[in-house]
Interface confidence: medium
């Protein structure tokens, strides 16, 4: 298309801190929309800017502004991630544990200079509040992780940014959007008990406390029932149990019964990121000649 000699919009730019795509409007137009890649579209506020919620400061993204009348469009790429290739933090990962703690870790970029320092910022999707890392994990003075003991500022999806600084060269940044449900590691189930009568054994347990607000339907459990003093390589009995209001599993086991142990682990039914196993609970007799469960 031929370039408009008098475009209605000029000086398209991103105000990164405010997360606003803004421009100069040179004449009256009807309806302006902003499009991020193809994925998100939004109407402009008073035809003067678009307010975004979670712009990436690392992933180069196309931002297009379209005018309905007169028909016109223009675009920019943001950001232009400056800094030497390979200097950004890498192998970034976070996990929530013990229901209210989070650790994030990363590694120094392969081409980062010796004086590189990294800083972690977290922004939630709703309140646009920025959380700065309160406690850094260090390796030879370089920040390579972060510990948070207050997760009240997080929402279901959060934006993580690792910035870098150096006196020698520009450092690229790393960013990522993470869902809390995908990064939470459950504690094992608690209060595991086994009660047996002459014919059956009943295992009960409590669902683990979690950061997410989950119902019993969101849990899946695995029970590992293991007979003691068996030959190496003998298979354990792994039982899958769906979460219930009262978590219990009843299985036939007649007296006299050999010594067994049971341990349980938990996962989100949709993700199946298993927790560690609970402490093994033993039941039955020490006599190795008795029957199995």
């Amino acid at each position: 298309t031929k370039e408009d000699p008098n475009p209605p919009i000029t000086n398209l730019r991103m105000k990164a801190k405010a997360q606003q795509l803004t421009w100069d409007l040179n004449r009256n137009v009807t309806d302006i929309e902003c499009v991020k890649d193809a994925d998100y579209s939004m109407p402009a506020v008073n035809n003067s800017y678009c307010q975004f919620g979670a712009i990436s400061l690392c992933e180069v993204t196309n931002y297009t502004v379209r005018v309905a009348n007169p028909p016109f469009s223009t675009w920019i790429l943001f950001p232009e991630n400056s800094g030497r290739e390979g200097t950004a933090a890498q192998n970034f990962s976070c996990f929530i544990y013990n229901a209210d703690l989070m650790n994030c870790t990363w590694a120094r970029g392969p081409t980062a200079p010796r004086d590189v320092q990294y800083f972690l910022y977290i922004r939630n999707s709703k309140r646009r509040r920025e959380i700065r890392c309160p406690y850094y994990i260090q390796d030879s003075g370089t920040h390579v992780g972060c510990h948070l003991d207050n997760l009240s500022g997080l929402t279901s999806r959060n934006y993580f940014l690792v910035n870098g600084t150096s006196r020698e060269i520009g450092i690229q940044f790393f960013d990522s959007l993470l869902d809390t449900k995908k990064i939470e590691r459950f504690n094992p189930p608690s209060n595991v008990t086994v009660r047996c009568n002459t014919t059956h054994c009943l295992v009960r347990w409590k669902q683990p406390r979690t950061y997410q607000k989950l119902s019993y339907l969101d849990f899946q459990y695995q029970l590992d029932v293991h007979r003691k003093n068996t030959q190496p390589g003998t298979e354990n009995l792994l039982i899958n149990v769906s979460g219930d209001l009262e978590n219990r599993y009843n299985f036939p086991s007649s007296e006299p019964r050999a010594k067994h142990s049971v341990k349980i682990r938990a996962a989100d039914v949709r993700i199946l990121n298993w927790s560690s196993w609970s402490e093994a609970i033993e039941f039955g007799s020490d006599d190795g000649n008795l029957g199995s469960v």
Partner: antibody, heavy 125, light 107 residues
């Protein structure tokens, strides 16, 4: 319950024109971007057109640009596709599709949350 | 245009088994991949959005994963009602494009 009902499919000669309609119900039509997607006899899906909730902005792939026009009448809860200069490659089942709800102020118009049953367009002499 | 390649073209499985569908993009699309199911003589139905986000009303046996160029749709334990064609679609850039589909059939 979201319901999309397409109509207007027919047998048309090459070079001819046709207008498809889609009647929407079960949701606030004026709040959602809408699209047309077609599927040929080999079952290939192809996105054809998208219009934003207010009707000001339209999107087309190069294969139909200049020949097809998507429009909507929010007062009638209806979506339309005006097709002209039709050729045999336009033979397909045409589906009307609703985009997702708005999300933090964004209008997600790039994936298809609900589909109609389709209306068949055959271009042949 | 971004080309999406789905493999295999046909998958034959026994009921109760786990099955995986692959979708590969010709360039990085982040997580902007969506999955649809189309049963015989039916219309497409959204299963998974943004690579791994679940959809209300879709059975929990369906899950998705992947980012960049490689994506997977999993069915935990196939049921007879899952016999259908499965399509991926990208929304990273215009034009929106679909894969050619994978047909799931029972052994």
């Amino acid at each position: 319950e979201v319901k999309l009902v397409e109509s207007g499919g027919d047998l048309v000669k090459p070079g001819g024109s046709l207008k498809l309609s889609c009647a929407a119900s079960g949701f606030t039509f004026s709040n959602y971007a809408m699209s047309w997607v077609r599927q040929n006899s080999e079952k290939r899906l192809e996105w054809v057109a998208t219009i934003n909730s207010g009707g000001s902005f339209t999107y087309y792939p190069d294969s139909v640009k200049g020949r097809f026009t998507i429009s909507r009448d929010n007062a009638k809860d209806s979506l339309y596709l005006q097709m002209s200069s039709l050729n045999s490659e336009d033979t397909a089942m045409y589906y009307c599709a609703r985009q997702s709800e708005a999300y933090y102020g964004y209008d997600k118009r790039t994936w298809f949350a609900y589909w109609g049953q389709g209306t068949l367009v055959t271009v042949s002499s | 245009d971004i080309l999406l390649t789905q493999s295999p073209a046909i998958l034959s499985v026994s009921p109760g088994t786990r099955v995986s569908f692959s979708c590969r993009a010709s360039q990085s699309v982040g997580t902007s991949i969506h999955w649809y199911q189309q049963r015989p003589n039916g219309f497409p139905r959204l299963l998974i959005k943004y690579a791994s986000e679940s959809i209300s009303g879709i059975p929990s046996r369906f899950s998705g994963s992947g980012s960049g160029t490689d994506f997977t749709l999993n069915i935990n334990s196939v049921e007879s009602e899952d016999i259908a064609d499965y399509y991926c679609q990208q929304s990273k850039s215009w034009p929106l494009t679909f894969g050619a589909g994978t047909k799931l059939e029972l052994k």
